[in-house]
């Protein structure tokens, strides 16, 4: 069963807002770059189903379960002609290189969920970085949405170099590290 | 007085290498694209002065002090007539916009020494950085020459963003340094 989630019947977050329990995630859409899920609420009939922003939800298992089915369903639709969704129709003046057009076509054919730059949103700032997955990745915050996701640094370097440089300028501290600074992997003093 | 620095009489970094103290930075040169400083060692006579690679040094204050004098000295040379260096004669297919041509003409008329991007060379890599002059500056190594010079970061960011990004990526160290490495916020040691 789903975790308790604040049901935002209206967006004002009053102190004594009631708690509801999500029974099932039924559908997914992107509105103004923000992911929303259609929820069935425990103890309420289907007519009370509501679309809720992903950021308000606290039922990762249910979302995860839904996404597995959603991906399979989308893959099954591959050969069917379909209406372009709002999120796919959205134009972006950020980047429209041949590569983007190719990847958009590929996505339209495979109907996968758009991730990273494929979402067609404009990068705003990098809010973190990690190489824990092998490749250097940036956690990218996009304009006009609170959502962020991990993108390959090598892709960001090309698609939005000034945002990458701004991140490094802001985040790289220039101190000289002590000689015992461990590992000395990337040595060359890098200070 | 200078910080302790490993004096690399030979480049093998043995575990029990002795510690020496730098008293003064006397001169600067670029060898195979690598900046080296001529050091006077505390407690040793002038005959023991040695050229040391910048990356082995940990005396940012002394380097900064030397660089101020060095720049002034270089500026003083500006009005002397001089042989055009090989690096100035070299053509570059890196950038030949109308602005570049205009600034080249202006330079030929005023007989100023070309500096940084005005030299019309193709950037190869950034080998150091400093903000000791207020603005962030990169020490740029140019293709097909051992000469390097300081360029404004904000100019490099626009003219060769991928080289700037490569420099930063190299300096992103993925292990944690001890706390006493901190403080030195945006220190001037700068690589």
């Amino acid at each position: 069963m789903g975790k308790k989630t604040k049901r935002t019947a209206d967006s004002s977050s009053s102190e004594d807002e009631e708690e509801y329990v999500v029974e099932k995630v039924l559908d997914r859409r992107v509105v103004k770059g923000q992911v929303e899920y259609l929820l069935k609420w425990k103890g309420f009939s289907e007519e009370h189903n509501t679309w809720e922003p992903e950021k308000n939800l606290d039922c990762p298992e249910l979302i995860s379960e839904f996404m597995k089915k959603y991906k399979k369903m989308k893959e099954g639709e591959n050969n069917k002609p379909r209406e372009k969704s709002e999120s796919n129709k959205r134009k972006s003046n950020f980047s429209n290189s041949a590569d983007d057009i190719k990847s958009k076509k590929k996505r339209e054919q495979s109907n996968d969920i758009a991730r990273g730059f494929e979402r067609g949103l404009e990068p705003e700032k990098i809010i973190g970085a990690t190489d824990s997955c092998g490749d250097l990745m940036f956690l990218m915050k996009w304009k006009d949405t609170d959502e962020a996701d991990l993108v390959l640094a090598k892709e960001a370097n090309v698609k939005c170099p000034q945002i990458v440089i701004a991140f490094y300028e802001e985040r790289l501290t220039w101190h000289a590290y002590p000689e015992d600074a461990e590992n000395k992997e990337k040595e060359t003093a890098k200070s | 007085m200078g910080k302790k620095t490993k004096r690399t009489a030979d480049s093998s970094s043995s575990e029990d290498e002795e510690e020496y103290v730098v008293e003064k930075v006397l001169d600067r040169r670029v060898v195979k694209g690598q900046v080296e400083y001529l050091l006077k060692w505390k407690g040793f006579s002038e005959e023991h002065n040695t050229w040391e690679p910048e990356k082995n040094l940990d005396c940012p204050e002394l380097i900064s002090e030397f660089m101020k004098k060095y720049k002034k000295m270089k500026e003083g040379e500006n009005n002397k007539p001089r042989e055009k260096s090989e690096s100035n004669k070299r053509k570059s297919n890196f950038s030949n916009s109308a602005d570049d041509i205009k600034s080249k003409k202006k330079r030929e008329q005023s007989n100023d020494i070309a500096r940084g991007f005005e030299r019309g060379l193709e950037p190869e890599k950034i080998i150091g950085a400093t903000d000791s002059c207020g603005d962030l500056m990169f020490l740029m190594k140019w293709k097909d020459t051992d000469e390097a010079d300081l360029v404004l970061a904000k100019e490099a960011n626009v003219k060769c963003p991928q080289i700037v990004i490569a420099f930063y990526e190299e300096r992103l160290t993925w292990h944690a340094y001890p706390e006493d490495a901190e403080n030195k916020e945006k220190e001037t040691a700068k690589s």
Epitope: L57, P60, G128, T130, S132, R171 | W174, N183
Partner: antibody
Framework: AVQLVQSGAEVKKPGESLRISCKGS????????ISWVRQMPGKGLEWMGR????????NYSPSFQGHVTISADKSISTAYLQWSSLKTSDTAMYYC??????????????WGQGTLVTVSS | ASALTQPASVSGSPGQSITISCTGT?????????VSWYQQHPGKAPKLMIY???KRPSGVSNRFSGSKSGNTASLTISGLQAEDEADYYC???????????FGGGTKLTVLG
């Protein structure tokens, strides 16, 4: 050395407002996020949210969104956690914390000493 | 957000190795190699022991190591010592809406 110094313990009544602080020193304050973590008596750690002091960009945990506000004043290297109307369930130890590296995504390596907030009628 | 699942307690004798598990979902632990582990002694602030799955901050003994398989992360402490007795918490990045989520904590007891 890196230091995060938090304001002292507070005893408040339900419905009152409160702002606690966390002053960073020994490092470039605007280069590192500050996170806030709650620990209720005898319980585990809960991540509340974080702020980038360079531009005051925040992320909140859904459990705390709307209940607390995280802010920062970079001119005095200080981050804040505030409540407009406290509840007894807000009684807890609150820690501010800073990542080890400027670019860390979700780990924190330097912690404040904690501020104990007691809300009781 | 739902807490990551840790055993309430584990114990071991000095010199032994123990492993603490931290089970999440495909939305957090499973999706990102961004799990960190914290040690907390009574009345003290937590201390970072492992970050980004398996990286160890300087000053942390190499007796502590981290790993991940699927939706489960693990902290292994080898050559158990009396001073290792403490509470241990895992934490994972959980996507941009939840951001970070902690485990419920595990009390480690060093016997004898």
């Amino acid at each position: 050395a890196v230091q995060l110094v938090q304001s002292g313990a507070e005893v408040k009544k339900p419905g009152e407002s409160l702002r606690i602080s966390c002053k960073g020193s020994g490092y470039s304050f605007t280069s590192y996020w500050i996170s806030w973590v709650r620990q209720m008596p005898g319980k585990g750690l809960e991540w509340m949210g974080r702020i980038d002091p360079s531009d005051s960009y925040t992320n909140y945990s859904p459990s705390f969104q709307g209940h607390v506000t995280i802010s920062a004043d970079k001119s005095i290297s200080t981050a804040y956690l505030q409540w407009s109307s406290l509840k007894t369930s807000d009684t807890a130890m609150y820690y501010c914390a800073r990542p080890l590296q400027t670019y860390s995504i979700a780990s924190v390596g330097h912690w404040g000493q904690g501020t104990l907030v007691t809300v009781s009628s | 957000a739902s807490a990551l699942t840790q055993p309430a307690s584990v114990s071991g004798s000095p010199g032994q190795s123990i492993t603490i598990s931290c089970t999440g979902t495909s939305s957090d632990v499973g999706s990102y190699n961004l799990v960190s582990w914290y040690q907390q002694h009574p009345g003290k602030a937590p201390k970072l022991m492992i970050y980004e799955g398996s990286k160890r901050p300087s000053g942390v003994s190499n007796r502590f190591s981290g790993s991940k398989s699927g939706n489960t992360a693990s902290l292994t402490i080898s050559g158990l010592q009396a001073e290792d007795e403490a509470d241990y918490y895992c934490c994972s990045y959980a996507g941009s809406s939840t951001f970070a989520v902690f485990g419920g904590g595990t009390k480690l007891t060093v016997l004898g």
